[in-house]
């Protein structure tokens, strides 16, 4: 921002009323009113160019310094060409000297040259030649000098003529301030510019109404340079929640809009399924039946729990069930749907029911499922099972109602036994099997059926209560097809896969384990 000038002295604006002191009195500098650029103006002039050595002084009135540390002196003046004065060229000069003196009191008419310190020799960029002057055109020069630091209550300026033909049209003395400033939603007070050119005064800003320094952000600061310019902004303020930046201020969010945190972003329109917000809202309340999860941003629409899963099917495969379902028709407006599967078993004889989580096995953990199918195994035969699939999302926990679908299935067969070849010889095969422990109590006997591969006319059956059998009197180096089936009081259970096991050839030795 441009520096602000505070004027301490303005000769041109005073209309000849300042009454500056001339020394020697009545000689040298002279105040007169003249017309320049068709305007009557007062000016001090001197033109003793033919009179040899000159030492004519013009001293300003005493100027109160106030808060100024460095002053700037702007001079507007015109100098006539020494060649305009025939015979005057030898003693004629085209410069004058600028001086200042500090003091704590006004010395009045007591003028003492020795108290003055020279600031500079003032030389014109352009001189006024005779032809210009006679046509009433003078070349106006503008020079600026600065002095500081000043420490006394006031000061004088003085102009020393050493034999020039010069007119002083304007003397303006001012100091500079960095003007009051609003930047980055921070207010910086008007600040006096320092006196030392390299130094920058650090000035703390204050956040405007309804603005705050963001968490972890830097407090707003600016630097006031010697020329009254603000430099190097640091930090900023942001409009607090419920307010947005409008030009250099924070304005409350309009009704129907909200802003949930201090940020640079504008207020946002209330999202779907929210009630109209009042002015200055930090969030928008949800419509009845809609909710916002703790981790949901305020900008997200309010949502509700999903409807129940769609099309739940339970397909029994022996002592296993595959559950399949489709996602809810209404997701509640969310994408974070998960499923939970629970299981209940009922005994047909007694009609008694109870949870079965401990006795069954799921293909993946039954809670927090993201897929839409799961396999449940280790089911007991001749048992009724009811499976419940519940759909949940991020706001389901905010309501007591549940969204679920159930499917029931009756297990009529045991699960097929898992068969292993334990050993073999040229004439025998040792076979073992297993079924899930919950089903074992319901098995009366196991039936092992075997025959030569390729012989479809005859087969052999062996029954046993145990979990293994050795099949003897077999042909060497021959492949046999073997199947094991559980027998229960209610009938046959599911048969195992048909396995191909081969006896050893005669060259093979004894009873080798496989």
């Amino acid at each position: 921002a441009q520096g602000k000038e505070v004027v301490l002295l303005d000769f041109a604006a005073a209309g000849g009323e300042l009454g500056w002191l001339t020394h020697p009195y009545g000689k040298g500098w002279d105040l007169m009113q003249n017309i320049m650029n068709d305007m009557p103006i007062y000016m001090y002039s001197v033109c003793n160019v033919m009179s040899g050595d000159q030492d004519n002084w013009l001293r300003t009135n005493w100027v109160y310094r106030g808060e100024a540390e460095r002053i700037f002196i702007e001079l507007k003046f015109t100098v006539r060409d020494c060649n305009s004065f025939p015979g005057g060229a030898s003693s004629c000069k085209e410069t004058f000297n600028l001086y200042y003196a500090e003091s704590d009191l006004d010395y009045g008419t007591n003028f003492q040259k020795r108290l003055f310190t020279k600031i500079d020799t003032i030389a014109p960029d352009e001189i006024t030649v005779s032809s210009d002057f006679e046509a009433r055109h003078v070349k106006l020069n503008v020079e600026e000098r600065s002095v500081g630091p000043l420490t006394r209550k006031g000061f004088y300026l003085a102009f020393q003529d050493i034999g020039a033909c010069v007119a002083l049209l304007s003397v303006r003395v001012y100091y500079k301030k960095c003007p009051e400033l609003l930047q980055g939603l921070a207010h910086f007070p008007e600040t006096i510019a320092g006196s030392d050119a390299p130094s920058l005064a650090t000035v703390a800003g204050t956040c405007v109404d309804h603005a705050v320094v963001p968490p972890g952000g830097e407090e707003p600061r600016m630097h006031c340079a010697v020329d009254g310019e603000w430099l190097v902004p640091i930090g900023q303020c942001l409009c607090q929640a419920g307010y947005e930046k409008v030009e250099d201020a924070c304005q409350a969010c309009s009704p129907g809009f909200f802003k949930f945190e201090a940020s640079e972003s504008p207020c946002l329109e209330c999202p779907e399924h929210t009630l109209p917000s009042p002015e200055g809202a930090t969030s928008c309340e949800c419509e009845e039946g809609f909710f916002r999860a703790p981790q949901d941003p305020a900008s997200m629409p309010c949502t509700r729990p999903p409807s129940a899963p769609h099309y739940l099917t339970a397909v029994g495969m022996g002592a296993k069930v595959e559950l399949r379902w489709t996602p809810p028709q209404d997701s509640g407006g969310r994408e974070d749907i998960v499923y939970s599967v629970t299981c209940e078993q009922c005994w047909p004889e007694s009609g008694e029911c109870g949870p079965c989580e401990a006795s069954v096995r799921y293909s993946e953990p039954p809670h927090g499922l993201t897929r839409t199918s799961v396999t449940v195994s280790d089911l007991e035969p001749h048992m009724n099972y009811t499976f419940t699939v519940e759909a949940r999302n991020g706001v389901s926990g905010l309501v007591t109602s549940r969204s679920f679908r159930t499917a029931s299935v009756s297990i009529n067969q045991t699960e097929p036994p898992k068969v292993r070849l334990e050993g073999r010889s040229t004439t025998s095969l040792s076979v073992s099997w297993s079924i899930p422990p919950p089903q074992q109590s319901r098995v009366w006997k196991y039936e092992v059926t075997y025959r030569k591969k390729g012989d479809s006319n005859s087969y052999n059956v062996r029954r046993t209560e145990g979990f293994s059998v050795t099949l003897d009197d077999l042909a060497p180096d021959t492949t046999y097809l073997v199947q094991v089936q559980a027998l229960t009081q209610e009938g046959q259970g599911a048969g195992s896969k048909v396995h191909e096991f081969q006896t050893l050839s005669p060259e093979g030795s004894g009873n080798l384990a496989v």
Partner: antibody
Framework: EVQLLESGGGLVQPGGSLRLSCAAS????????MYWVRQAPGKGLEWVSS????????YYADSVKGRFTISRDNSKNTLYLQMNSLRAEDTAVYYC???????????WGLGSDYWGQGTLVTVSS | DIQMTQSPSSVSASVGDRVTITCRAS??????LAWYQQKPGKAPKLLIY???SLQSGVPSRFSGSGSGTDFTLTISSLQPEDFATYYC?????????FGGGTKVEIK
């Protein structure tokens, strides 16, 4: 003390010539514009001619243009008006006048601060 | 040429009276106007320059005002030595021109 002293006036027949002089003292003559102003008997003031400090530009009233010539000799501090082809209507008291202004502004042309006592020119047959 | 018109051409007044003389230029002359006083048989005397600046040595009862085309010379309290003829003169451009004069007479 500033003084301007005109001379050279008198009676002259129509068509005749006169040369007026104005001797200046008490100021730096070479700095200032100078003027000739006349006043016919019982009439008002009429500007006749001007010359700049350097002797450069000269200006004349339409009524005398081509007949009168203004000049100056800064070394002698003297202003002149050469009047030719005089007419009866040129009868007047002729004043030389100095441009006002001190120091720097000498010759700026604000007005005339010093006047001579005047010399009478009578054109009559 | 710029014509200067003075009014009134004469005015009768008594000692102590306030007298106002006006001068009108045929075109704008900014503040390039001078006022002179002339007594019979004497050379004119400069009173005011630059429309409103009092010439050194002139009594402060004389004042000038105006700019552009309309100008005024005011004598705030007429003194016996002020009975004379007053002329305005434009110094804006050549040819320099005077007003016709205003004669201030004793009533």
């Amino acid at each position: 003390e500033v003084q301007l002293l005109e001379s050279g006036g008198g009676l002259v027949q129509p068509g005749g010539s006169l040369r007026l002089s104005c001797a200046a003292s008490g100021f730096t003559f070479s700095y200032y514009r100078m003027y000739w102003v006349r006043q016919a008997p019982g009439k008002g003031l009429e500007w006749v001619s001007s010359i700049y400090s350097s002797g450069g530009p000269t200006y004349y009233a339409d009524s005398v243009k081509g007949r009168f010539t203004i000049s100056r000799d800064n070394s002698k501090n003297t202003l002149y008006l050469q009047m030719n082809s005089l007419r009866a209507e040129d009868t007047a008291v002729y004043y030389c006048a100095k441009d006002m202004g001190t120091g720097f502004w000498s010759g700026w042309g604000l007005g005339s601060d010093y006047w001579g006592q005047g010399t009478l020119v009578t054109v009559s047959s | 040429d710029i014509q200067m018109t003075q009014s009134p051409s004469s005015v009768s007044a008594s000692v102590g009276d306030r007298v106002t003389i006006t001068c009108r230029a045929s075109q704008g002359i900014s503040s390039w106007l001078a006022w002179y006083q002339q007594k019979p048989g004497k050379a004119p005397k400069l009173l005011i320059y630059a429309a409103s600046s009092l010439q050194s040595g002139v009594p402060s009862r004389f004042s000038g005002s105006g700019s552009g085309t309309d100008f005024t010379l005011t004598i705030s309290s007429l003194q016996p030595e002020d009975f004379a003829t007053y002329y305005c003169q434009q110094a804006n451009s050549f040819p320099l021109t005077f007003g016709g004069g205003t004669k201030v007479e004793i009533k």
